[in-house]
Each structure stands twice: as structure tokens, then as C-alpha cells.
């Protein structure tokens, strides 16, 4: 029978006439940066190039005895997972392996950084197709190996991480806290996040996805037949790295913005229990377990957006949080969110002629967090208008007045400590679907875009006094591009977006009483591109 | 033994490259910073990535590479030049005493100094 | 659940060898290093000895140095310490205990036994 | 002889806070991960605190961990009778490659 693993990251709608891959990877070439491997195993024989590349520290120990099945024993499993014959995932892909680890597992960021920049130098002089790098280890955070590894990626480079073993925040390690890697949690046959002992997988925002990590049958280096069941993160990282070159195999032109988008889109969505995460981590790791997509040329025609997280601001009065997207995404919304609901709101802001997202911390808040809602829209244009308080009258607005531009989301950023005691209007007045309405002691930024065939619906689901969160989701077809809470009063805690739906989360006040003035409404904007859609159908 | 005796090589190369008109002063702008892993048992002190500005050439890391030892070996100090990059990252990586690390911060073209440290299969 | 049996302990005379064995139960053995550690009695907590997960690396204490031998069978899950030439001062309450982790051994030890007492008499 | 000291024993009443201190080098604590255990009476130990401040699942909030230097601290806050016992600070030793453990601390609850 199939491997739960295995079995896991193929698509619900699987079926077995209808989802075959025409080669598994066979387009990609997956570099392995790990210990040795034993080359001639069954499951990997012709399918691992060793190059001879070598940069490991000595063993710990006076009396290390070197074992050639226990020196080869991690790579070897992972090579099986990426590529193996029987249990591996893109069973087409052909695999080059770098030594950058010791018999016993240890490595050293120098030995990773030139193992690194041997990949780049083999790629300048023999240009290949598709490139995928698994890195299945971990250090301290190091700035040197996330620049190492921003560079490569930017040089079409896909990296794939393990988040790391220490049941901690992925951000505290490299290179899995390197925003251009593809950071992969571990998570068990029951979909709960895998457990070793008193440590664990690592979570957090540094992590893009989860995906199977525990008791995963690959090849052992004990013998050229046998096979053994090895967990953690590297596992994981391995299976994202096998679909990876799937996906790549598929599409070769698909930009590293693109795989993740499609990566993140393809997965199973909220299957992991929370609970095992710290509570101050929860909203900020993804729930989501990688998967296969249903077929091999899919979803072009799809708007993809995906949430980032920004570092936590700190708790000093003017400190603030910025949330990027990458390079070839669009910042088509931002939102902010404080534990303590002390926040001065968030704007959209140009930064290195690209656009950010800017959370406010207020006095007496323990920080904020900015939410950056990033899109693959091509071809867009998009800019950000902006309305400065309206002081007196019923509440501040802005719209997107260019013709052909769309409202794609809205921000609002205050100077006054406590919105709270600024009471905002009672009845809140209905626009144009293109407007951002906000409170008057607020300045509110719209932004809006153009593109192609883009439209975009504002959905909104209010409630009578807040309880704990209120939610409001997007139609099948149409992706949430923004998220926001009105009237942004001082219990509301934030705004912010999981998958397709716009969270709101304010302080239940239901143990205090309410006025119809603490109502709190969570606001979508809904987007779907009519272009990419048609393009879709034009090459079918 | 051969250890030392190649520090020893390279360093009569280091005094004998010296160039004399090479100031010790650091380029004016922004003062390179230095980073160290944050778990203790994880550092490696003793090698370090010294990592010089984006558009550095890889004449310039060598020269700057150099100018590092001439410097150190005025000093007494013996220093390893592991490697040099270029690629993905312009710099190199030297085994070098930490009380060096203050006059190669100094160095022109540096961007950052990273002492080494290690990774773990996962 | 995640269990530590000892067993084998005794009284023994000096000079004498005595085998502890420690039985390992509800979690994947052969992914962690185990140690054992000892308590005389009123005393203070006393490490023994260490054992990667794979045994490839084993690490003592000097005060049982060439006397004790730490082993393990991880198709039995069984972890073991060999002790000869037993003195006097080797009488305590034996535990033995899981590392936090296979590769970062000097994290600690999450999982105790119940002990096994061992007594060094003549 | 042990080389990592820690105070013989420290009191305070319920509800009170107590630390502990543990006093190392730099071939220990200075470069080292530090763990924390519990030992109630007649019991094993018990993993309280690990990587100097990490809580295993189970342990409450109320137990913290810190390091600074060469010395390592553990904080018992609104101590509770049940938290009687002896509490050890161990870290591995680079110089003697080995484990070591601190001297222990007796804490009584008044």
C-alpha cells in the first residue's frame, strides 16, 4: 500500500486515470546540500550525480568510529524521499548531491555558503533546466547564509528549508528564517505538528508550509535494499522539494514567486490542530500541509495572493512593523494586529520604489504586528490614495478616482492614542464599492491597481458587539485581496487574512455591555482577474 | 605541523605583498557591523566571513584579503585566508584571532563581519 | 507513554563488575543519545556517561573512566552500563535518562527512569 | 567537587518569588546550553527548563530560566508548597567533555 506520506500530498481529487504526471521531475535538477550518500542504493541508483564537492568540520569525540552506512545515513534517506523509485515523490528528478555535513550531522554556515555558491558557479557554466536546492539543516540566524541564499534565489534559484527541530520560532534559525526560502515545518499521519521527544517541529511566521515529516519510509544506507523510517524537518523540506520539481517539471517557466503562490494554494487548508503551537505563535503560522496539484497545468487563470507577517514591532510608543512582499508580488492590501488592541493602525508606504506595509504601535502597547496581503498580478499598476483625517464630518474616505483602477484594499492610520474615546459615527456611510470609509480621526489608504481583466467586490459581515472574532470570506473563484475591520475602534484588535477569508479579531466585551457604536464589521475585498482567466481558456 | 608551516607561507606572503600605500583607514559611509551566532554552543570563534560590499570585485576581495593579513602580521598575528568569494557573495572566509576583528571591520569594501558557526542535519 | 525501566542493580562487593540495564519504551529509541547519572545517598546529582543515538560516540566521566562502559541495543531498545572494579563510592541510586536530542547532546535529559540502586559493600 | 555552584538553599513564603543562582565558567555555562531540574523527595528528576529558558510541555509559566555570562538563574514566581525540593542546574562541560551538574538547591516553602 501507499505510504501515508506519500498518500497525503496527493490531491483529494486524485484519481489514478486522471493524475499522471507525465514525468515527475524529470525537467529538474534537485541539488542536495547534506552528508554523504550511498549512491548505489536501489531506491536512487542512477538518479544521484555525487559531486565532489566536500567542506565538513571533523567529528565531535576522540573515539568517533566512522561508519560509512551511518555517515551516509541522512542524505541518503532524504535523496530517497526527493527521487526514490518506490517512496519518492518526484520519481523523475535527477539529483546532484553536495557534502556539507559530517558523519555525525554537523555542518558549518562557511561550509554552506561555499557549497552554495558551487551551485551558482555550476549553473553559470553548464545552464540547465529548472533548479531546486534542498537544504534540509539548520543554524543559529545567520545574515550571512539568508543573503547567500536571497542571491541565489534571485538568480532563479528555487530553495527549499527544513523550519528546524527545536519546537521553536523558524525565524531564530538559517537559513529557514531567509524570506526568499521556502520554509517547511514537519507535520505527523494525524496532521499534528510532529513532536521529538521534548522538541519538536519549529513554527512560526519563517514558515511557509507544512508537510509530512514523521516515521517517513525512505532508502537506508544500511544495505543497497533497505529502507527505514526517519522523521523531522529535512523530511518534510524533501517532500516540498519533490513537488517542487513537479510543479517545475510541469511549468519550467514558473518564477520562485509563482511556486510558492501555487504551493501555498494547493495545500490542505486548516488540518493542523493549533494547539500545539505556543498561543502567541498561532496566528502566525500557516495551517497549511503541502500537496500536489490536482493536475499539471493548473491554475494559471487564478489570482494568487498569500499573507505575510511581519517581525513583531516591539513595545516602545513609536515603534512600527514592516511587512514586504517579494519581489515580483503586489502589496494589494495591509492590515495590522496588536494583542493588546493599542495600535495607531497601518498605511501602505513606498520603500525602495516598492510598495510596504507599515504597522503603528500606540503608548502602552506591548507592539503590533503588519500583515502584508501579496498578490502575482501581471502587469499591474498599482498606487496607493490616500484621505487625511476628516475631523469633523461622518468619517473619513478614499477612492480610487483613475479610470480603469480598482479597489483592491484599505488602511487606516491615526495619531490620536485611543480611537476608543473618539467615538466614531453611528451609521457608517455607503459609497461607491470603489471607497475606503473609515473613522474621522483616521487618515484611510486606498490601494487601488490596475490590470488586465481585474475586478474586485467588497464583502462585508457585521456583527452587533464584538465576540472574540468575526469573519467574512471570499466566493469560490474570487481571491481575498483585502482585509479590514470598521470602525476600527480601540477594541478591535486587528484585521488580517487566513487563506480566503478576512479574520477580525476584536476584545469580547459582551461581559461589559455594548452600544450599537461598538458594532464591528469585518471587510473583504474580493478580486478575480477575467484576463488570466480567458488566457487560461485560450491555451486549452 | 603542515598547518603551521603553511600559516607561516602565508604569512611571508602577507609582509611581502605588503603595498605601501595602502591607508589603514575605512572608506567613509556606514561603519561595517559584526554578527555572532546567538547560541553560544553553536559558535565557532576563531573563523570568520568577512563580507564586503554588493558590487566588490573579486580583485578587490583578494586585495582587501591581503591587506587583512599585512595588517594582522604588523601586528604579530598569524591569519588563513580559507577562501574567497564570488558568485553569490563578495568576501572571504579567514581563520583569524577575534582581536583582529576590530581592525578588519575597518577594512575598505566591508560590509559585515559573520564569525562561523555550526549547522545540524535537521 | 515514553518510559525508563533500570534494572540490575544490587549489592556488590568491591572489585567486583555488576551490568544495569535500562529498558526504553514509547518512542523511537535509536533517535536519541541516552546518559545514565547517578545520586549517592543525600548526595548531589552525579553524571556518568553518555551514548550517541547510533553509539557511535561514548563519553564518561573521569571518575569512571576505564571502569564503567556505556552500550546500547536499539533493536531491543535497551540501554546498558557495564560497571567493573566497583568501589565503595559507586554506591547510588542509578538513573538513566534520554537526551533532549540525538545531535545537540548537551541540551540535557527530558525523560528520568525510576533508578536502580547499586551498593558497593564488602 | 562540582563544578557548577549553587546556593544550599533558599526559602520564601507561598506566593513569594525565589531564584536560584548557578555559577559556572566559560568551558561550561559560558558556552554551553543550560538545563534545570526538579527533584521532589524520593523522586527521579525532572526536566524543568532547557536551552536556558525553554519550558518542556507541562511545565508552568511560573518557572523562567535566564544566563548571563558564566552564571545561569532559575525564577520560581507565586511559589506553591508542591514546589518543595532540591533543584539542580546541569550543562555540558567542553573542557572535561562531559555532563556536569550544579551542587543543588534546597528550596522550602515557609
Known amino acids: 500500500s501507499i505510504p501515508w506520506n506519500l498518500e497525503r500530498i496527493t490531491p483529494p481529487r486524485y484519481r489514478a486515470d486522471e493524475y499522471q504526471p507525465p514525468d515527475g521531475g524529470s525537467l529538474v535538477e534537485v541539488y542536495l546540500l547534506d552528508t554523504s550518500i550511498q549512491s548505489d542504493h536501489r531506491e536512487i541508483e542512477g538518479r544521484v550525480m555525487v559531486t565532489d564537492f566536500e567542506n565538513v568540520p571533523e567529528e565531535d569525540g576522540t573515539r568517533f568510529h566512522r561508519q560509512a552506512s551511518k555517515c551516509d545515513s541522512h542524505g541518503t534517506h532524504l535523496a530517497g524521499v526527493v527521487s526514490g523509485r518506490d517512496a519518492g515523490v518526484a520519481k523523475g528528478a535527477s539529483m546532484r548531491s553536495l557534502r556539507v555535513l559530517n558523519c555525525q550531522g554537523k555542518g558549518t554556515v562557511s561550509g554552506t555558503l561555499i557549497g552554495l555558491e558551487f551551485i551558482r558557479k555550476s549553473q553559470l557554466v553548464q545552464p540547465v533546466g529548472p533548479l531546486v536546492v534542498l537544504l534540509p539543516l539548520a543554524g543559529g540566524y545567520s545574515r550571512v547564509l539568508n543573503a547567500a541564499c536571497q542571491r541565489l534565489a534571485r538568480a532563479g534559484v528555487v530553495l527549499v528549508t527544513a523550519a528546524g527541530n527545536f519546537r521553536d520560532d523558524a525565524c531564530l534559525y538559517s537559513p529557514a528564517s531567509a524570506p526568499e526560502v521556502i520554509t517547511v515545518g514537519a507535520t505527523n499521519a494525524q496532521d499534528q505538528p510532529v513532536t521529538l521527544g521534548t522538541l519538536g517541529t519549529n513554527f512560526g511566521r519563517c514558515v511557509d508550509l507544512f508537510a509530512p515529516g514523521e516515521d517517513i519510509i525512505g532508502a537506508s544506507s544500511d544495505c543497497s535494499t533497505c529502507f527505514v523510517s526517519q522523521s523531522g524537518t529535512s523530511q518534510a523540506a524533501a517532500h516540498v522539494a519533490g513537488i517542487a520539481a513537479m510543479m517545475l517539471s510541469a511549468e519550467p517557466e514558473l518564477t520562485l514567486a509563482e511556486l510558492r503562490q501555487r504551493l501555498i494554494h494547493f495545500s490542505a487548508k486548516d488540518v493542523i490542530n493549533e494547539a500545539w503551537f505556543p498561543e502567541d505563535q498561532r496566528v502566525l503560522t500557516p495551517n497549511l500541509v503541502a500537496a500536489l496539484p490536482p493536475s499539471t497545468h493548473g491554475a494559471g487563470w487564478q489570482l494568487f495572493c498569500r499573507t505575510v507577517w511581519s517581525a513583531h514591532s516591539g513595545p516602545t510608543r513609536m515603534a512600527t512593523a514592516i511587512a514586504r512582499c517579494a519581489p515580483d508580488e503586489e502589496l494589494l492590501s495591509c492590515s495590522s494586529f496588536s494583542r493588546s488592541g493599542k495600535r495607531r493602525g497601518e498605511r501602505m508606504e513606498a520603500q525602495g520604489g516598492k510598495l510596504v506595509c507599515r504597522a503603528h504601535n500606540a503608548f502602552g502597547g506591548e507592539g503590533v504586528y503588519a500583515i502584508a496581503r501579496c498578490c502575482l498580478l501581471p502587469q499591474a499598476n498599482c498606487s496607493v490614495h490616500t484621505a487625511p483625517p476628516a475631523e469633523a464630518s461622518m468619517g473619513t474616505r478614499v477612492h480610487c478616482h483613475q479610470q480603469g483602477h480598482v479597489l483592491t484594499g484599505c488602511s487606516s492610520h491615526w495619531e490620536v492614542e485611543d480611537l476608543g474615546t473618539h467615538k466614531p459615527p453611528v451609521l457608517r456611510p455607503r459609497g461607491q464599492p470603489n471607497q475606503c470609509v473609515g473613522h474621522r480621526e483616521a487618515s484611510i489608504h486606498a490601494s487601488c491597481c490596475h490590470a488586465p481583466g481585474l475586478e474586485c467586490k467588497v464583502k462585508e459581515h457585521g456583527i452587533p458587539a464584538p465576540q472574540g472574532q468575526v469573519t467574512v470570506a471570499c466566493e469560490e473563484g474570487w481571491t481575498l485581496t483585502g482585509c479590514s475591520a470598521l470602525p476600527g475602534t480601540s477594541h478591535v484588535l486587528g484585521a488580517y487574512a487566513v487563506d480566503n477569508t478576512c479574520v477580525v479579531r476584536s476584545r469580547d466585551v459582551s461581559t461589559t455591555g455594548s452600544t450599537s457604536e461598538e458594532a464591528v464589521t469585518a471587510v473583504a475585498i474580493c478580486c478575480r482577474s477575467r484576463h488570466l482567466a480567458q488566457a487560461s481558456q485560450e491555451l486549452q | 605541523q603542515e598547518d603551521e608551516d603553511g600559516d607561516y607561507e602565508e604569512l611571508v606572503l602577507a609582509l611581502r605583498s605588503e603595498e605601501d600605500g595602502l591607508a589603514e583607514a575605512p572608506e567613509h559611509g556606514t561603519t561595517a557591523t559584526f554578527h555572532r551566532c546567538a547560541k553560544d554552543p553553536w559558535r565557532l570563534p576563531g573563523t570568520y566571513v568577512v563580507v564586503l560590499k554588493e558590487e566588490t570585485h573579486l580583485s578587490q576581495s583578494e586585495r582587501t584579503a591581503r591587506r587583512l593579513q599585512a595588517q594582522a602580521a604588523r601586528r604579530g598575528y598569524l591569519t588563513k585566508i580559507l577562501h574567497v568569494f564570488h558568485g553569490l557573495l563578495p568576501g572571504f572566509l579567514v581563520k583569524m584571532s577575534g582581536d583582529l576583528l576590530e581592525l578588519a571591520l575597518k577594512l575598505p569594501h566591508v560590509d559585515y563581519i559573520e564569525e562561523d558557526s555550526s549547522v545540524f542535519a535537521q | 507513554q515514553v518510559q525508563l525501566v533500570e534494572s540490575g542493580g544490587g549489592v556488590v562487593q568491591p572489585g567486583r563488575s555488576l551490568r544495569l540495564s535500562c529498558a526504553a519504551s514509547g518512542f523511537t529509541f535509536s533517535s536519541f543519545g541516552m546518559h545514565w547519572v547517578r545520586q549517592a545517598p543525600g548526595k548531589g546529582l552525579e553524571w556518568v556517561a553518555l551514548i550517541w543515538n547510533d553509539g557511535s560516540n561514548k563519553y564518561y566521566a573521569d571518575s569512571v573512566k576505564g571502569r564503567f562502559t556505556i552500550s546500547r541495543d536499539n533493536s531491543k531498545n535497551t540501554l546498558y552500563l557495564q560497571m567493573n572494579s566497583l568501589r565503595a563510592e559507586d554506591t547510588a541510586v542509578y538513573y538513566c535518562a534520554r537526551a533532549i536530542a540525538a545531535l545537540y547532546y548537551y541540551y540535557g535529559m527530558d525523560v528520568w527512569g525510576q533508578g536502580t540502586t547499586v551498593t558497593v559493600s564488602s | 567537587q562540582s563544578v557548577l555552584t549553587q546556593p544550599p538553599s533558599v526559602s520564601a513564603a507561598p506566593g513569594q518569588k525565589v531564584t536560584i543562582s548557578c555559577s559556572g565558567s566559560s568551558s561550561n555555562i559560558g558556552n554551553n546550553f543550560v538545563s534545570w531540574y526538579q527533584q521532589l523527595p524520593g523522586t527521579a528528576p525532572k526536566l524543568l527548563i532547557y536551552?536556558?529558558?525553554k519550558r518542556p510541555s507541562g511545565i508552568p509559566d511560573r518557572f523562567s530560566g535566564s544566563k548571563s555570562g558564566t552564571s545561569a538563574t532559575l525564577g520560581i514566581t507565586g511559589l506553591q508548597t508542591g514546589d518543595e525540593a532540591d533543584y539542580y542546574c546541569g550543562t555540558w562541560d567542553s573542557s572535561l567533555s562531559g555532563y556536569v551538574f550544579g551542587t543543588g538547591t534546597r528550596v522550602t516553602v515557609l
Open positions: 536551552d536556558y529558558n
